[in-house]
Each structure stands twice: as C-alpha cells, then as structure tokens.
C-alpha cells in the first residue's frame, strides 16, 4: 500500500532543488532564488542561511544545500552548524563576562577558546615535576624520585620557567 501511494503521489517525484507546487497542480517547480530543498518530495523550499556580521560564508547556498557559515578572524564557532560566534582570547586567558582574563595561578589554557584548567598534580601519580606550569602550558611530570636511585641514569630537569609566582606547589 505504501509503495502504491508513493507511486500515486506526484510530490514524491520532485527531486532536491525543487518543490511540489500546490499552486501549479503539484508540478515540481524550481526553488525560488536564495532558497533550497535538500531532499526530494518537499512541499516548500527553505530560505538560505545568510552569513552576516561576525559570521562569514564558508560554503555558498545552492538550490540543493544550505549555506554554511564560520566566524570572522578573532572569533570561533559554537553550537551545531556554527550557530554562534564567540570571541577568541589569547593562550593563557579565558573568556569571562568582562572579557578576556588571564588564567589564575595554578591553571592554564593552551588554546584561544575554552576555560583555564588546573595544572596536573604530578604527585598524585607518584611523579615529580619535570617542567613548571605556566598560564599557557601544563606542568610536565617526570619520573618519581624513587626512580632516580643511585645507578639509574639521572635526568637533569630544565631550568624552571622564568615567571614569578608560577612554580608548582
């Protein structure tokens, strides 16, 4: 029955890029300008997304597919299909309601987006700090002090980062 019905339904023959035009006896008409239908059998076409303001066009709209947007430099996409653009910050910062703020001591952010995250606590894994953390970088954990027993090859840690107040706790 379903198959019979689909064969009798003239709209099922309308391919993507057209719509089943009720004003013209259900004939397949091409989508109006700046609109699209991405599947067959549609009774309307959808208006093309316009990438304006902080959005820029990544892919132009066509009669069969919507436009795709991304964000202008200094901003990054959020949400499904880049529904929002959020301001970039520098590495070592996070975006707050008052704008970009430096990461607090003991935290870092190595990207231009997202939040500051706490440095890794090396001692929880029984390891020692090999390289100090900064606002932009996590600490690097090295072998545990027990691993550096006499006879084992010694590891000379690099000089600590020269950022006052940023030595690991």
């Amino acid at each position: 029955f379903e198959r019979t019905r689909s064969l009798q339904d003239p709209c099922s023959n309308c391919p993507a890029g057209t719509f089943c035009d009720n004003n013209r006896n259900q004939i397949c008409s091409p989508c109006p300008p700046n609109s699209f239908s991405s599947a067959g059998g549609q009774r309307t076409c959808d208006i093309c997304r316009q990438c304006k303001g902080v959005f820029r066009t990544r892919k132009e709209c066509s009669s069969t597919s919507n436009a795709e947007c991304d964000c202008t430099p200094g901003f990054h996409c959020l949400g499904a299909g880049c529904s929002m653009c959020e301001q970039d910050c520098k590495q070592g910062q996070e975006l707050t309601k008052k704008g970009c703020k430096d990461c607090c001591f003991g935290t870092f952010n190595d990207q231009k987006r997202g939040i500051c995250r706490p440095w890794t606590n090396c001692s929880l894994d029984g390891k020692s700090v090999l390289v100090n953390g900064t606002k932009e970088r996590d600490v690097v954990c090295g072998p545990s002090p027990a691993d550096l027993s006499p006879g084992a090859s010694s590891v000379t840690p690099p000089a600590p980062a020269r950022e006052p107040g940023h030595s690991p706790q």
């Epitope: 890029g17 004003n23 013209r24 008409s29 091409p30 989508c31 109006p32 300008p33 700046n34 609109s35 309307t44 076409c45 208006i47 132009e60 709209c61 066509s62 009669s63 069969t64």
Partner: nanobody, 126 residues
Framework: EVQLVESGGGLVQAGASLTLSCVIS????????MGWYRQAPGKERAFVGT???????IYSDSVKGRFTISTDDGKNTMYLQMNNLKPEDTAVYYC????????????????????WGKGTLVTVSS
C-alpha cells in the same frame, strides 16, 4: 510580452537521440530558472529537469543519465539533448521559465510568475 517557443520534436526509433530547443523572447524578461516538462497521452504534466537560480541542473530520476539540459545565453535558448530514447518518453515537451515579480530576490517568494511554451511532440516508436 514573454514568449517561449519549442522546436525539434518528431518521430524517432527507440534508442535514437533528439535535441529540443526553446527560444525565449520578450522585453526586460529576467528568469531565475528554466525547465523542461512533458505530458504523455492521458497523463498529468511531469517534471523533466531544470536549471536553478544558482545554475545547478537537476533531472527527474526517469531521465537522469540520458537527458542533458544546456543553454546558450547569447541566443536566449535552452536545449534538451535526449539520448537512448524509450517508448515511454513519448510526450509533448514543454519549456518553462520562472521569474519573481519586481526582481524580489531577497525574500522567499512563492508568488512566482511562470511562462510556458506551446510544446513540441516527441514520439518514440519501438
């Protein structure tokens, strides 16, 4: 006044090829899309293919791979190249052109104006 005139129809054997032409004339006519349709004896008019507002070319499943739509903008002409014709392709073939009133391309406007030719008959014998 806008006029569309089809030509090129005729009687051919199955498996043969045929090219239809559609010439558009008329003052200040700006179409956003043009299409080919056909009406077989005793049936409703059916979609064959169209050139869309962004110059995509779309075909019905029944002719895909066999028929090709093209245009010659300098001559205001659209063509339908039909290869490997089958008896079920027998129909009167119409061309159509679509425009939007007042050139309103900014809003989704279903108040479309369509213009149709009088058709040309294609008969495919087995």
């Amino acid at each position: 006044e806008v006029q569309l005139v089809e030509s090129g129809g005729g009687l051919v054997q199955a498996g043969a090829s045929l090219t239809l032409s559609c010439v558009i004339s008329g003052r200040t006519f700006s179409s956003y899309a043009m299409g080919w349709y056909r009406q077989a004896p005793g049936k409703e008019r059916a979609f064959v293919g169209t050139i869309t507002w962004n110059n995509d070319i779309i075909y019905s499943d029944s002719v895909k791979g066999r028929f090709t739509i093209s245009t010659d903008d300098g001559k205001n002409t659209m063509y339908l190249q039909m290869n490997n014709l089958k008896p079920e392709d027998t129909a009167v073939y119409y061309c159509a052109a679509y425009s939007v009133p007042y050139g309103d391309f900014c809003t989704l406007n279903y108040d479309l104006m369509d213009y149709w030719g009088k058709g040309t008959l294609v008969t495919v014998s087995s």
